[in-house]
């Protein structure tokens, strides 16, 4: 059991009041983390409280403003970025969000040399994504779906693309499918490290078929909503990447750089770039059916002006039990010979490890083994690597810093933050400054988070850059309810669980359970990490346990686990709730007639089927923006773990795993089911599409849509969607308000 | 060495077309993109068009609609198909290794005359 | 589109002297996209000056190109005889590139 810090010294239980809805919608008790913006290996740059861009420098401990609150202001500026040369900072104002990732804003430059905005050859409004090359100042955009490179910022731009068209050619930006699925970023353009060239992905989405919905707004007549989005088996945009010489664009002009052989024999992905010098770059390709992938390694020909990807220099993964990699196909780091490369994969007994690979995967060196996985590769240095697993105390929700000495030989681990502060922090990541001379640690539970600096060759810490101290202060007299990370072992599987509890927790009396699921490929829901949100509250005041639990298909326990849904999406998730829920009852202290579940998207759609598996265990539950069938949702998610919705395919599959076709199984269940109208991500049709099977089926439920809203369901929206949910469960419970 | 050689000059009449050709040696002629520049009797030098390694294609607004510019890659070959042809098309016509500038390496040129 | 417009039409020297020719665009331009071409009588134009001061491949020293923003020059130090010929500059920032009218550089 983890016992929240606020809580040991407080004996006045009287004095302690219970958490608030209020509280949560209010974010009463959110946290800080300190991320620094690391500008070379011994400086960063951070906003300060009131606005101020300053920096520090570790070792001389001086620290000084480079913009003031009053310049930033003077624009409504809401973000920057200096120019590695530091001659100049890009300040960001009318920030307008597209999707997850992308946002246009309106950018302005301003000249730290004398103090002034720069006036003449201003960018042009609005920016589709701006960023500086690695050296120097030269400036690459988005505007209008195509690029343009600045030499100097007050150089007048040279248009390095002309095809780019609203929802048809996008360069340099991902199309709705690659941002959200493939590339997780606003941008795909990419530097060399020393900005002689300029990379960037062209998407074509000409032929892409096209998701509309209204957008009610505040006119007579709604607007439509057009976005390219290829559902599961529906044609996809094709790629192709580019890289032009940015000391003479206008010479060479933009050279498409080849697509392996094996991979473009069929639909293929782009999957990402890593740049490993200006004359070397490596570009990652995957088979749309996601069970290969291709890392080619490409070199700059000087005599021929062109991109090189010779066949000896093409690593191929693939994956016999399910899809390749994890959520994502993970992407190298360059070690500094150029050549060779370290990359988490699949070792033999299927756990995802750091590999080296120096000429052939076949050859690899496996650098980290055990029944464990490593998670990500921070940073590699001439003497060690730097990487997160969840190896310690065999805690798959824990995250822990390690390094490995790759400079001696046998090389030695050792666990950099393990004990640090053990029973406070057992969740990090870490932020590294140029060469690893420097790190932070952000830990993010399960006690107060708190961030912290580090020496890069010591590991001594240097200083607390954000421990919370005003959260730790204000949760003193709140009863937090108490959780534990627990493991079920049911049949051969872990079931690993949280289990958040009452304040006051007996376990001779009977709680009302709600399990919260998500469930999706690759995800985590038990992690150790710190949180006062709506469950907290849930708990803390109105008496519920809560329980959420990772089955099959959830990540870092291996592949068998995580491959166990391959080709079945909506079967094992389900089961292996259903078993938890079992598991609990069995513990004596969960009233059995008093049992719901909920969840959100891929959640919404497991909350969805085990309300409808006739099991009679769930008096109640609720779905928000929920998945209904895999062919409704975006091709290279569903396909990645479905296959294709063809007969010679996986079709009967993706007909029997739709929520639909157990509308008859909602009978005996109270149901509500939420979504947005403007849902981008996952569309309202999904929701109405239950609606219309339920209604078909004559089956009672309740619903709630939010007009004009996406799948964050943000702003007013939340505090409405968390009040309405509340009264849903209590009511559920039989709890009084 | 890098050699442009042009050809398919000639005497044609308005409304006329006519396709020049541009074989290229000396260079990886695949990975370059490629220009023709036209020259007007006693006058300066005119941008036609350029194509891309990849393909693009990029028009002046004069020629934009009755010019199309190709390349056949295997034949390291460029091309320059003219229709619709005008008087005010007569001009020397240079294929010219590059994009938008720095035009390192011209052809000897071949003269298009348009004419009744 | 940008217009390039260069100084004197003509220009008339001996060998040996010195040479500036000037080329003013009608809009900002960056000096990456500045070159400079010598183009003789009967002859295809031959590439000078890029980037507006870096001297092409096989190029003399005694030509060397200097400006940025809208002014622009190209200077040859010591005239040889075969350095009299047509002088163009152009540029290549936006669609269409374009070329000045030229400078003749003649035998005074």
């Known amino acids: 059991i983890v016992l929240r810090p606020s809580r040991v010294h407080n004996s006045e239980e009287n004095t302690m009041r219970a958490l608030t809805l209020k509280d949560i919608l209010n974010g009463t008790f959110s946290y800080k983390t300190f991320f620094p913006n690391w500008i070379s290996g011994q400086e960063y740059l951070h906003q300060s409280a009131d606005n101020n861009i300053v920096l520090y420098n570790i070792e001389t401990g001086q620290s000084y403003t480079i913009l003031s609150n009053r310049t930033m202001k003077s624009v409504n500026a809401s973000n920057y970025g200096l120019s590695p040369d530091r001659q100049f900072v890009y300040l960001e104002s009318d920030y307008s969000k597209l999707w997850r990732y992308s946002y246009t804003a309106t950018y302005y430059i301003y000249d730290l040399s004398n103090g002034e905005f720069v006036r003449g050859n201003e960018l042009p409004r609005p920016i589709q994504y701006l960023c500086w090359s690695p050296v120097g100042s030269k400036l690459a955009y988005v505007y209008q779906n195509n690029i343009y490179l600045k030499q100097r910022p007050g150089d007048p731009p040279f248009q390095i693309t002309f095809n780019g068209r609203e929802n048809k050619i996008f360069n340099g930006i991902p199309d709705w499918v690659y941002e959200e699925e493939m590339l997780a970023t606003k941008y795909a353009l990419w530097w060399s490290p020393n900005g002689k060239f300029l990379a960037y992905a062209e998407f074509n989405d000409t032929d892409i078929p096209v998701i509309a919905y209204s957008y009610y707004g505040d006119e007579q007549y709604p607007r439509t909503i057009n976005i390219p989005y290829p559902k599961a088996g529906a044609k996809n945009p094709v790629v192709r990447i580019f890289i032009i010489d940015t000391t003479y664009p206008a010479y060479v002009g933009p050279q498409e750089v080849p697509v392996p052989a094996m991979i473009a024999s069929s639909d293929y992905y782009f999957s990402w770039l890593t740049w490993v010098t200006d004359e070397r770059v490596c570009l990652q390709w995957l088979k749309r059916v996601q069970n290969v992938s291709v890392l080619s390694i490409c070199d700059f020909r000087e005599d021929w002006q062109t991109w090189d990807c010779p066949k000896t220099q093409e690593h191929i993964e693939e994956s016999r039990t399910g899809w390749a990699g994890g959520f994502f196909v993970s992407t190298p780091v360059f070690s500094y010979d150029a050549i060779s490369y370290y990359k988490i994969f699949s070792d033999k007994d299927g756990y995802k490890h750091i590999h080296y690979i120096k000429d052939t995967v076949e050859n690899a060196i496996q650098i980290t083994s055990g029944k464990w996985e490593a998670i990500n590769i921070f940073r590699v240095t001439q003497d060690s690597l730097f990487y997160s697993s969840n190896e310690f105390e065999e805690y798959p929700g824990r995250r822990n810093i390690y390094r490995i000495s790759i400079g001696s030989y046998p090389p030695s681990k050792k666990c950099v933050t393990c004990h640090l502060r053990k029973e406070r922090c057992q969740y990090y990541t870490a932020s590294f400054s140029d060469y690893a001379k420097y790190y932070a640690l952000v830990c993010y539970g399960p006690g107060i988070p708190i961030s912290t600096l580090h020496d890069g060759r010591t590991d001594q810490e240097i200083k607390i850059l954000e421990e919370n101290k005003e959260l730790e202060n204000a949760l003193k007299n709140i009863q937090l309810p108490k959780e534990e990370i627990k493991k079920l072992e049911v049949d051969e599987i872990t079931l690993w669980y949280k289990m958040i509890l009452p304040p006051q927790f007996d376990r001779s009396k009977k709680y009302p359970l709600l399990i919260q699921v998500y469930g999706g490929p690759c995800s985590q829901s038990v992690r150790s990490v710190f949180a006062v949100n709506w469950i907290s509250y849930l708990a803390s005041k109105e008496g519920m346990v809560i329980a959420l639990v990772d089955g099959r298909g959830t990540a870092f326990q291996g592949d068998k686990l995580l491959y166990a849904v391959y080709r079945k999406l909506g079967v094992y998730e389900v089961e292996d709730q259903i078993t938890a829920v079992r598991k609990f009852i069995e513990m004596g202290f969960i009233d059995e007639k008093r049992i719901a579940i909920w969840g959100w998207s891929y959640g919404g759609y497991v909350s969805s089927l085990a309300l409808a598996s006739g099991t009679g265990l769930f008096k109640c539950g609720i779905a928000v923006a929920p998945v209904s069938s895999w062919e409704y949702y975006a091709s290279v998610y569903t396909e990645r773990f479905m296959g294709l919705p063809t007969k010679d395919d996986n079709l009967e599959h993706y007909k029997n795993s739709t929520v639909m076709a157990r509308a008859e199984y909602f009978r005996n269940v109270d149901y509500l089911l939420i979504h947005g109208t403007a849902d981008d991500n996952v569309h309202f049709q999904n929701s109405a599409q239950i609606a219309k099977a339920l209604v078909n089926a004559q089956v009672d439920f309740q619903a709630m849509w939010y007009s004009d809203q996406n799948h964050g369901l943000s702003g007013l929206s939340t505090n409405h969607l968390y009040t309405h949910m509340t009264h849903f469960l209590k009511q559920c419970f039989s709890l009084s308000d | 060495q890098v050699q442009l050689l042009e050809s398919g000059g000639g005497l044609v009449q308005p409304g006329g077309s006519l396709r020049l050709s541009c074989a290229a040696s000396?260079?990886?002629?695949?990975?370059?993109?490629m220009s023709w520049v036209r020259q007007a009797p006693g006058k300066g030098l005119e941008w036609v068009s350029a194509i891309w390694a990849s393909g693009e294609q990029y028009y002046a607004d004069s020629v934009k609609g009755r010019f199309t510019i190709s390349r056949d890659n295997s034949k390291n070959t460029l091309y320059l198909q003219m229709n619709s042809l005008r008087a005010e098309d007569t001009a020397v016509y240079y294929c010219a290794k590059g994009w938008l500038g720095n035009f390192d390496y011209w052809g000897q040129g071949t003269l298009v005359t348009v004419s009744s | 589109e940008i217009v390039l417009t260069q100084s004197p039409g003509t220009l008339s020297l001996s060998p040996g002297e010195r040479a500036t020719l000037s080329c003013r665009a009608s809009q900002s331009v960056s000096r990456s996209y500045l070159a400079w071409y010598q183009q003789k009588p009967g002859q295809a134009p031959r590439l000078l000056i890029i980037g507006a001061s870096t001297r092409a491949t096989g190029i003399p020293d005694r030509f060397s190109g200097s400006g940025s923003g809208t002014d622009f020059t190209l200077t040859i130090s010591r005239l040889e005889p075969e350095d009299f010929a047509v002088y163009y500059c152009?540029?290549?920032?936006?669609?269409?590139?374009?070329f000045g009218q030229g400078t003749k550089v003649e035998i005074k």
């Open positions: 000396g260079f990886t002629f695949s990975s370059h993109a």
């Open positions: 152009q540029q290549g920032q936006v669609i269409p590139p374009t």
